[in-house]
């Protein structure tokens, strides 16, 4: 699997999850989240050659098409597969609220 | 929705489904499919700016991050959303077989 265990410990050039830390204030301009100040969101990057963690029958076909037509703009793209939630604390007035923001952290990628 | 109805009738520059015809023999090197000779597979292409058909909370955050950091390599990508099957005819010996190949035709796209 193209997950953090594999990707963070390798020098994989193909589609893999990469490290990205997002600071809510500096990177997004968000003040409303009290805790945490930022988080390891990660992101997906890298080419999707034939048979590399392909998602569907279509992405297999498209990767093979791309193999035969390397100049074509049609190619699978490296996108998140498994996402995890992020617990946050924010305030409504003076009342702290705890919420899980769903689908916030990329754990693995796929070629779609 | 970024589907064939909208995308094929507009000059949309952002993420949208685009027309692509794949000839099984010429484009994939496949001889095993007897009918059809090829099909309209389509593909997804175009940038994914802030709020453009974003798939998850993560892709919204990443698009906003990208808006503030335009040089960053972390950005959502335009990929298939709705896929449809393709009925094919192939031969096993002299016996024709009809099969549905699932997830073969792109009907709509999303930013993931």
């Amino acid at each position: 699997a193209l997950d953090t265990n594999y990707c963070f410990s390798s020098t994989e050039k193909n589609c893999c999850v990469r490290q990205l830390y997002i600071d809510f204030r500096k990177d997004l301009g968000w003040k409303w989240i009290h805790e945490p100040k930022g988080y390891h969101a990660n992101f997906c990057l890298g080419p999707c050659p034939y048979i590399w963690s392909l998602d569907t029958q279509y992405s297999k076909v498209l990767a093979l098409y791309n193999q035969h037509n390397p100049g074509a703009s049609a190619a699978p793209c490296c996108v998140p597969q498994a996402l995890e939630p992020l617990p946050i604390v924010y305030y409504v007035g003076r009342k702290p609220k705890v919420e899980q923001l769903s689908n916030m952290i990329v754990r693995s990628c796929k070629c779609s | 929705a970024l589907d064939t109805n909208y995308c094929f009738s507009s000059t949309e520059k952002n993420c949208c489904v685009r027309q692509l015809y794949i000839d099984f023999r010429k484009d994939l090197g496949w001889k095993w499919i007897h009918e059809p000779k090829g099909y309209h597979a389509n593909f997804c292409l175009g940038p994914c700016p802030y709020i453009w058909s974003l798939d998850t909370q993560y892709s919204k955050v990443l698009a906003l991050y990208n808006q503030h950091n335009p040089g960053a390599s972390a950005a959502p990508c335009c990929v298939p959303q709705a896929l449809e099957p393709l009925p094919i005819v192939y031969y096993v010996g002299r016996k024709p077989k009809v099969e549905q190949l699932s997830n073969m035709i792109v009907r709509s796209c999303k930013c993931s």
Epitope: L28, G29, W30, K31, W32 | I51, Q57, L64
Partner: nanobody, 114 residues
Amino acid sequence: QLQLVESGGGLVQPGESLRLSCAASGIIFSASTMAWFRQAPGKQRELVALITDGDRTNYADSVKGRFTISRDNAENTVYLQMTELKFEDTAVYYCNAFWLKAYWGQGTQVTVSS
């Protein structure tokens, strides 16, 4: 029920100014990233300007130096001050709010014509 209501659109001549307003209700406005988008006939909807809850702003290249986005958290309103309007600014302008999910207003027409 969440509502975004735009106002301030109209017919102006090139070089003139307009101020659009978007009043929000039913969301935590002060936490929301607010944005203005526009859609000209036969064109895609495009981002014009956005302002985060931390007052960080971002503008489309075509409006930089002419348009200013601002917000009033006490009034739950976001504004778009448009100056030196051009023919190509003609479009329906939509207000957008993003907090946990995205919300849209119905739009207000801006026409620049001589």
